[in-house]
Interface confidence: low
């Protein structure tokens, strides 16, 4: 199936040009998306091209600037947030990145009613997190690991917590491991729907071992970065959840929410918090051995000013074949009765589907079913449930948006997106206004991305928000590669693959093959999305065939494939890449003397193991920031899939699955190993240990480090990295420079 055909005709060939590496590094062919910042059922804010903050009313068709670019520029603001009562806007400047989601910033409050910045009781700096209450203009913020509350922006702050301490106690923000592997947010506080209560997490990292690495900077002596970072089997953070009444914060102070007894009996995690009403909250907990999750619904007791979590409102989710959930345990979407909810979890056939839980999980009503998976519940209204799935035409790498009418019986299902722009758009996400009165659809491909606005009642398209016309015009004279998404059936396993082919591809010729791999549990690489990236250039200009393969352990094709890697990472992911390569060779257009593999992070681990598999298939390969031993990686992630590195659990496979154990096998391949020295995520330690093992085995290899760079290798390092990898591959494939 050719998803993105090259628009090359013989008459046009002389005016068409191939992609260049410069195009990729300059972001010449990057696309834009439009996500409305909804502020009501029919209104949204958007930052215009000239940086004005504009309010759009869909129903009146009116738009006006609520905040000028002049005001934004006056404090060098890069972000903003309107208070729900629309009286104030916070302006965010001095952005300073910390980890994946976290950053600190300076905040200014602008009063829209008088057109001036709020003076007096200004916010301290730098702030770790700040947010408005859902109603009115209360402010909660985190400063130096403590939480503060302001009833109004100009008021003095009320200090909620006092025990916050750098790298020790975190209030309202996650520590490193919770940020990266559990919450996937920079915050750990949650307002109740009307702003009466504020819930927050406290993380105690006092006993966690610290990872320390040098940050070289420009000074005479390097700095040492210290991060409490629990590696597999190490001591974990201790988490507690508190709730405070924000109307009378000093009355009884923060009240702790009790942990379910079956969870509290051993090491555990808090996984998410969902407010149901102002006086009902839902917490999700997870055992350290991550196959048991408990959802606990708690109610406020006015008489005692405490939170009560009856056992009758505890719902257990357990996996007998793997870990609980997909990448994370799914979160509930509550219905209007404020007790029943919709949630995605595995059905009896091992496919993730939407279930409706009214009293117990055992009595759950299955809402969707089939040999495909429901992926996300976007919104539940009185009469509709909107979700995404990969059901349509049985392509796991697509995403379409569906509406189920839950107001009628039996519920009817409608695909909202399947036939809108069928060739151009097969991978959607959505963003809904209050009560799903309107929604935006963002299509990511396989054609050029497009964002559109729709009526939530009729699904009618109202207008195009962004169609990337400039990009479309810029691509008119570019010889883009062809892309195919197909599947291989091997030993009762379906291996979906994406192949990126040179523009003048001829099946009778032989081409060098590059495998790009990620392959981590619950990931998906074969997706019907648009991209003009490094591998597009390698196909377009350098004439390579590039393939991406989703093997065992990858997501959205059922639990059999997903949980196949449980407790044995590094085995089947590698086998399936190798199997696919053999199948590609059989297709007849691959030069089997010129096959390479590359990957980043988990992909660097898989590419390293594939190179060291002893098959003789690969001439060369690249590992960027690879994991080399699961004992070096974060507890929350690693133990989810591998269990504990103890003798009575899974230590043997921890030891057997290292890259270092296969050092000898690198002798007959060209290996390029790359890592940033300030990688907070996959520590440089991983590559240092690979390099040491290769040296000890007297195996030659190539390496590149990026000083003071993290896991993303951003900025000028990106250009250096891709230029360096390009030279390496061209040399490997004997392609002239």
């Amino acid at each position: 199936i050719v998803l993105r055909p090259s628009r090359v005709h013989n008459s046009e060939e002389n005016t068409m040009r191939a992609l260049t590496l410069k195009d990729i590094l300059n972001g010449t062919f990057s696309y834009k998306t439009f996500f409305p910042n909804w502020i009501s059922g029919q209104e949204y804010l958007h930052q215009s091209a000239d940086n004005n903050i504009v309010l759009y009313n869909i129903e009146t068709g009116q738009s006006y600037t609520i905040l000028s670019n002049r005001t934004m520029k006056s404090v060098n603001a890069s972000n903003y947030g309107l208070s729900p009562d629309r009286q104030f806007v916070y302006l965010e400047s001095d952005y300073s990145k910390l980890w994946r989601y976290s950053y600190t910033a300076t905040y200014y409050i602008y009063d829209l009613s008088n057109g001036e910045f709020v003076r007096g009781n200004e916010l301290p700096r730098p702030i770790q997190y700040l947010c408005w209450s859902p109603v009115g203009s209360k402010l909660a913020y985190v400063y130096q690991n403590n939480i503060y509350l302001k009833q109004r922006p100009g008021d003095p702050p009320f200090q909620i917590t006092f025990n916050g301490r750098e790298n020790k106690i975190f209030n309202g923000i996650p520590d490193w491991v919770y940020e990266e592997e559990m919450l996937a947010t920079k915050y750990a506080l949650w307002w109740s729907p009307n702003g009466k209560f504020l819930a927050y997490a406290e993380f105690n990292d006092t006993d966690i071992p610290v990872i320390a690495y040098s940050y070289y900077g420009d000074e005479q002596y390097p700095r040492t970065i210290n991060i409490p970072y629990p590696k597999a089997g190490a001591k974990n953070p201790v988490v507690r959840i508190f709730i405070i009444d924000t109307t009378y914060p000093a009355y009884v102070g923060p009240q702790e929410v009790p942990v379910p007894a079956m969870i509290a009996s051993s090491d555990y995690y808090f996984s998410w918090l969902t407010w149901v009403t102002d006086e009902r909250v839902c917490l999700q907990w997870l055992k350290r051995v991550q196959n048991v999750s408990v959802l606990s619904i708690c109610d406020f007791r006015e008489d005692w000013q405490t939170w009560d979590c009856p056992k009758t409102q505890e719902h257990i989710e357990e996996s007998r074949t793997g870990w609980a959930g997909g990448f994370f345990v799914s979160t509930p979407v509550f219905s209007y009765d404020a007790i029943s909810y919709y949630k995605i979890f595995s059905d009896k056939d091992g496919y993730k589907h939407i279930h409706y839980i009214k009293d117990t999980v055992e009595n759950a009503i299955q809402i969707t079913s089939g040999k495909w998976e429901a992926i996300n519940i976007f919104r539940v209204t009185q009469d509709s449930l909107f979700y995404s799935s990969n059901e349509f035409e049985e392509y796991p790498g697509r995403r379409n948006i569906y509406r189920i009418s839950i107001g009628s019986y039996p519920p009817s299902k409608k695909c909202v997106t399947c036939h809108l722009r069928k060739e151009r758009c097969q991978y959607y996400t959505a963003s809904f206004s209050d009560y799903a009165k309107y929604y935006a659809l963002v299509c990511y491909g396989p054609g050029i991305p497009i964002s559109t606005l729709h009526d939530g009642r009729t699904d009618q398209e109202i207008k195009i928000l962004e169609e990337n016309k400039e990009l479309e015009n810029a691509l008119k004279n570019i010889q883009l590669p062809k892309e195919e998404i197909k599947k291989l059936e091997v030993d009762e396993i379906t291996l979906w693959y994406k192949m990126i082919l040179p523009p003048q591809f001829d099946r009778s010729k032989k081409y060098p093959l590059l495998i790009q791999v990620y392959g981590g549990p619950c990931s998906q690489s074969v997706r019907s999305v648009f991209a003009v990236n490094w591998i597009s250039y390698l196909a377009s200009k350098e004439g390579m065939v590039i393939a991406l393969v989703d093997g065992r352990g990858t997501a959205f094709q059922g639990d059999k494939l997903l949980y196949a890697v449980y407790r044995k990472l590094g085995v089947y992911e590698v086998e399936d890449q190798i199997t696919a390569v053999r199948k590609f060779i059989e297709m007849g257009f691959i030069d089997e003397k010129r096959i390479a593999i590359w990957g980043w992070s988990y992909g660097g681990y898989v590419s390293s193991l594939a190179l060291a598999s002893g098959t003789g298939l690969f001439k060369c390969g690249i590992a960027v920031a690879p994991v080399s031993s699961w004992e070096y990686y974060a507890s929350v992630y690693t133990e989810r899939f591998m269990g504990l590195p103890t003798k009575d659990d899974n230590l043997e496979h921890y030891k057997n699955s290292t890259v270092m154990a296969r050092a000898e096998y690198f002798r007959n391949v060209d290996y390029l190993l790359i890592h940033g020295t300030a990688d907070d995520n996959v520590h440089f330690q991983n590559s240092a240990q690979i390099a040491k093992a290769l040296v000890n085995a007297q195996v030659d290899f190539q390496a590149m480090w990026y000083s003071d760079q993290n896991h993303g290798l951003s900025g000028l390092s990106t250009n250096h990295l891709y230029t360096h990898m390009t030279h390496f591959l061209k040399q490997c494939f004997s392609l002239s420079d």
Epitope: S40, E43, N57, T60, I66, R86, Q87, L112
Partner: nanobody, 116 residues
């Protein structure tokens, strides 16, 4: 562009009551939030009370419990019932949508004077 006409102001003794009205030239049902503002001599304009389409209200600390905002979508009118008036409530009262539009969208306002 919506035209707004405020009325109902006047001179009143401290402790007295007034009901202000704001008539809009366009339907207000699709305007998410309407609000009353006031500006005392030599002071900045401030929000007094706001009301959203779903009926949720918001009041300045100084008027909470004394003033009540309401809206009649059928009549395209927003009201402000002011009880237990104090001298410090003396100001010109304006209505507008929330957040306020550009300066030219403001009405003439209605003067409220509370004598002690």
């Amino acid at each position: 562009q919506v035209q707004l006409q405020e009325s109902g102001g006047g001179l009143v003794q401290a402790g007295g009551s007034l009901r202000l009205s704001c008539a809009a030239s366009l339907k207000i049902s699709s305007i998410n939030a309407m609000a009353w503002y006031r500006q005392a001599a030599g002071k900045q304009r401030e929000l007094v009370a706001g009301i959203a389409t779903d009926g949720r209200t918001n009041y300045a600390h100084s008027v909470k419990g004394r003033f009540t905002i309401s809206r009649d979508n059928a009549k395209n009118t927003v009201y402000l019932q002011m009880n237990s008036l104090k001298p410090e409530d003396t100001a010109v009262y304006y209505c507008n949508q929330w957040p306020p539009r550009a300066l030219d969208a403001w009405g003439q306002g209605t003067q409220v004077t509370v004598s002690s």
